[in-house]
């Protein structure tokens, strides 16, 4: 007991009334108004509870505190008086805050702030919507993925911030009268090949595809090492150069130098260089055959192999290169007598005649082109007098029937067994390399040295043997007529040709030798 008569055991939040009683402080209550035992407690009164008599008024909230309460303006409202708290309705001066005016950037980008009582909302601009996790933030609507499919199928949808575009797909263009961008855009495929919008290398041919294009190697060309064919970046090289290399097993410096020149010409070859390249190859061949050097020291059989390889390769190279020439007639001649005549045309339905110093060739144009080949038609004739040196003593292999016929009408082969080459060796080629069975025959008229009387004159071609060498043969070639210094031959295939004089002794006037003009 306190000497002043005040209880010292009063519970928390209470004050003593006298020495034996306590009373709860304002804002607290206990079970009974007067507390007489220390076991009782004073609990905070929640003045803000529903049944409470406290009224803060509109636009305000009641906040309970320990032993008291405060009235404060609700979020979005503020007191006109400036007093942050108040106790009853009569002190309430709360009014709506215009957040939109207070903070113009409240809705960030792409939204418009709209004030509401106690708050605000964000109204998104067209093409935007409120973000669910942040209702105050406007985010772009991706019209392209929203399932609306706003664009025509010939276009592709391009989402923009707040909008979208219907753009022509790569390789497409707006149809005449159509815009390129709005949702009414309609497109069509661009033919990049005919419009010149392609990036194909000059070693390739452009092929249009739907919405794109591809570049394919020209006929006779192959993709460069490691580069696939039929791509936009395909680059090709002429196969003719890469395959025309010295024949295996032949050791000749002169020949090696010739092939070095061929490879040098092929290294930086481009279609536009075809004319110069053809001339340079024939110039090199002409020089090789004029001065064969160590080729002349090779055994005869090896010389024949070299000749076979040169004739075969030359035909391929000239065929490949001439496809890149522009239309027209070309004639080249070289100091040692090598001569080239070439005609390049778009397919025409007529016969073609190529005239040279020592030979004339006549055939139908329609033989020249392989069906489906888009390139120009080429007919070519090369006279290679110098090849005679390498083909000296080359064997003649007759078909059994011809062999028998000759034995019947002639006494037989004389002691000097090898036939004599009367004419220049000529090589004929077409853009079409399938010339083993021509639908209509080719006619050659050879000018040549005088025929020794009573000797058999034969129209022959060079047959490339399996062994890479070869021999003269007559299969598919017939001698139409001959006189002292000219012979007419007709053949059903193309290759390298010549007129031979075989050492047969003619017993009587041979009707085959009668000239047919």
């Amino acid at each position: 007991q306190d000497s002043r008569g005040c209880a010292r055991w009063c519970p928390q939040d209470s004050s003593c009334v006298n020495a034996t009683a306590c009373r709860c402080n304002p804002g607290f209550s206990s079970f009974s108004e007067i507390i007489t035992t220390p076991m009782e407690t004073c609990d905070d009164i929640n003045e803000c509870a529903t049944l409470s008599k406290v009224s803060c008024g509109k636009f305000s909230d009641c906040w309970n505190t320990e032993g008291s309460y405060d009235c404060v303006c609700s979020p979005g409202y503020e007191p006109v008086s400036g007093a942050k708290t108040f106790k009853n309705e009569s002190e309430n001066t709360c009014q709506d805050v215009d957040e939109c005016q207070q903070n113009p950037r409240l809705c960030k980008s792409y939204g418009t702030c709209v004030n509401t009582l106690g708050s605000y909302t964000c109204q998104c601009l067209p093409g935007f919507k409120l973000k669910p996790e942040d209702p105050k933030l406007c985010t772009d609507v991706n019209e392209c993925t929203s399932g609306q499919n706003p664009c025509h199928s010939s276009t592709h949808c391009l989402n923009n911030v707040g909008s979208y575009q219907c753009r022509c797909r790569p390789g497409w263009q707006p149809i005449p009268g159509s815009p390129n961008g709005p949702n009414n855009t309609v497109c069509e495929d661009v033919d990049e090949c005919s419009s010149g919008q392609h990036q194909c290398d000059s070693s390739t041919v452009c092929f249009n595809t739907v919405g794109s294009y591809s570049c394919r190697c020209r006929p006779g060309w192959k993709p460069r090492h490691g580069i696939p064919n039929n791509q936009k970046d395909t680059v090709c090289e002429d196969m003719t150069f890469s395959t025309w290399t010295p024949p295996p097993g032949v050791h000749s410096q002169t020949l090696s130098r010739f092939f070095d020149k061929v490879q040098d010409l092929g290294r930086d070859y481009k279609p536009g260089l075809a004319n110069n390249t053809i001339q340079s190859i024939l110039q090199a061949l002409d020089e090789l055959l004029e001065a064969p050097g160590d080729l002349e020291t090779l055994p005869r059989l090896q010389q024949h192999c070299v000749a076979s390889h040169l004739l075969d390769g030359l035909e391929d190279v000239l065929r490949g290169l001439s496809k890149n020439l522009s239309n027209g007639l070309l004639n080249f001649s070289y100091p040692a007598g090598t001569e080239l005549s070439l005609e390049v045309q778009k397919q025409v339905d007529r016969s073609v005649t190529l005239r040279q110093n020592q030979a004339v060739m006549q055939l139908d144009w329609n033989q020249a082109q392989k069906s489906g080949d888009p390139g120009p038609s080429v007919v070519g004739l090369v006279s290679i007098p110098g090849m005679g040196k390498l083909l000296a003593e080359a064997p003649l292999v007759l078909e059994p029937e011809k062999q028998m016929l000759l034995h019947e009408t002639h006494q037989g082969l004389l002691q000097d067994g090898s036939p004599i080459l009367l004419s220049d060796v000529i090589s004929a080629f077409l853009s079409n390399n399938d010339t083993q069975n021509l639908s209509s025959p080719v006619t050659f008229t050879f000018s040549h040295r005088s025929v020794i009387p009573r000797q058999k004159v034969l129209c022959v071609f060079w047959e490339h043997g399996q062994n890479g060498c070869g021999h003269w043969a007559t299969t598919g070639c017939s001698t139409i007529g001959t006189r002292d210094t000219s012979t007419i031959c007709r053949c059903t295939h193309l290759s390298s040709f010549a007129v031979l004089m075989a050492h047969y002794d003619v017993q009587e006037e041979d009707p085959v030798l009668t000239v047919i003009t």
């Epitope: 290398d201 000059s202 070693s203 130098r257 070095d260 020149k261 040098d264 010409l265 290294r267 930086d268 481009k270 279609p271 536009g272 260089l273 004319n275 110069n276 001339q279 340079s280 110039q283 090199a284």
Partner: antibody, heavy 118, light 106 residues
Framework: QVQLQQSGAEVKKPGASVKVSCKAS????????MQWVRQAPGQGLEWMGA????????RHTQKFKGRVTMTRDTSTSTVYMELSSLRSEDTAVYYC???????????WGQGTLVTVSS | EIVLTQSPATLSLSPGERATLSCSAS?????MHWYQQKPGLAPRLLIY???KLASGIPDRFSGSGSGTDFTLTISRLEPEDFAVYYC?????????FGQGTKVEIK
């Protein structure tokens, strides 16, 4: 007749770039590679590279790799040689020349003097 | 790369004399060309493909050789022939020139 007309002399600072042009006339532009050759004062001829006008394909020496760009404009029959990151040793007369493997460089431009000086 | 070495570096001769210029290659060359250059002018093609005379070149100039050794010959030097001569190979990239031979008046 064949003519190769080059652009005029240039003075450049180190680190800058220079673009020399060469306009061809009198022949089929795509039938020859166009070569670029330079000659430093009192020195010999040095091949830089070449461009094929038909498709823009180029060849160049390792020495100039990454620094030289050779282009062509077929509509004007003009080729261009741009040399970047210039240094004083790039001071030279730059020539364009029409060339083919077997025929050599048979026609030359008059030359363009490029002086690189700070 | 193919290195071309020209010799001699300088050739002192009188008009009317014969000049023989050599060009040696570090490896075999198929296409060798020769050029003449006078001070302040662009080079001029003299001989192409080892031995062929370029258009407008007088026939006192001739070329020969094969493989790695090539020669340019001027049969009788004229006053206008005193100049620098370069050989150039076109057999492998990079194309290369010789360092030049100066033909001067003795």
């Amino acid at each position: 007749q064949v003519q190769l007309q080059q652009s005029g002399a240039e003075v450049k600072k180190p680190g800058a770039s220079v673009k020399v042009s060469c306009k061809a006339s009198g022949y089929t532009f795509t039938n020859y590679w166009m070569q670029w050759v330079r000659q430093a004062p009192g020195q010999g001829l040095e091949w830089m590279g070449a461009v094929y006008p038909g498709d823009g394909d180029t060849r160049h020496t390792q020495k100039f790799k990454g620094r030289v760009t050779m282009t062509r404009d077929t509509s004007t029959s003009t080729v261009y040689m741009e040399l970047s990151s210039l240094r004083s040793e790039d001071t030279a007369v730059y020539y364009c020349a029409r060339g083919f493997t077997a025929y050599g460089m048979d026609y030359w431009g008059q030359g363009t003097l490029v002086t690189v000086s700070s | 790369e193919i290195v071309l070495t020209q010799s001699p570096a300088t050739l002192s001769l009188s008009p009317g004399e014969r000049a023989t210029l050599s060009c040696s290659a570090s490896s075999s060359v198929s296409y060798m060309h020769w050029y003449q250059q006078k001070p302040g002018l662009a080079p001029r093609l003299l001989i192409y493909d080892t031995s062929k005379l370029a258009s407008g070149i007088p026939d006192r100039f001739s070329g020969s050789g094969s493989g790695t050794d090539f020669t340019l010959t001027i049969s009788r030097l004229e006053p206008e022939d005193f100049a620098v001569y370069y050989c150039q190979q076109w057999s492998s990239n990079p194309l290369t020139f010789g360092q030049g031979t100066k033909v001067e008046i003795k």
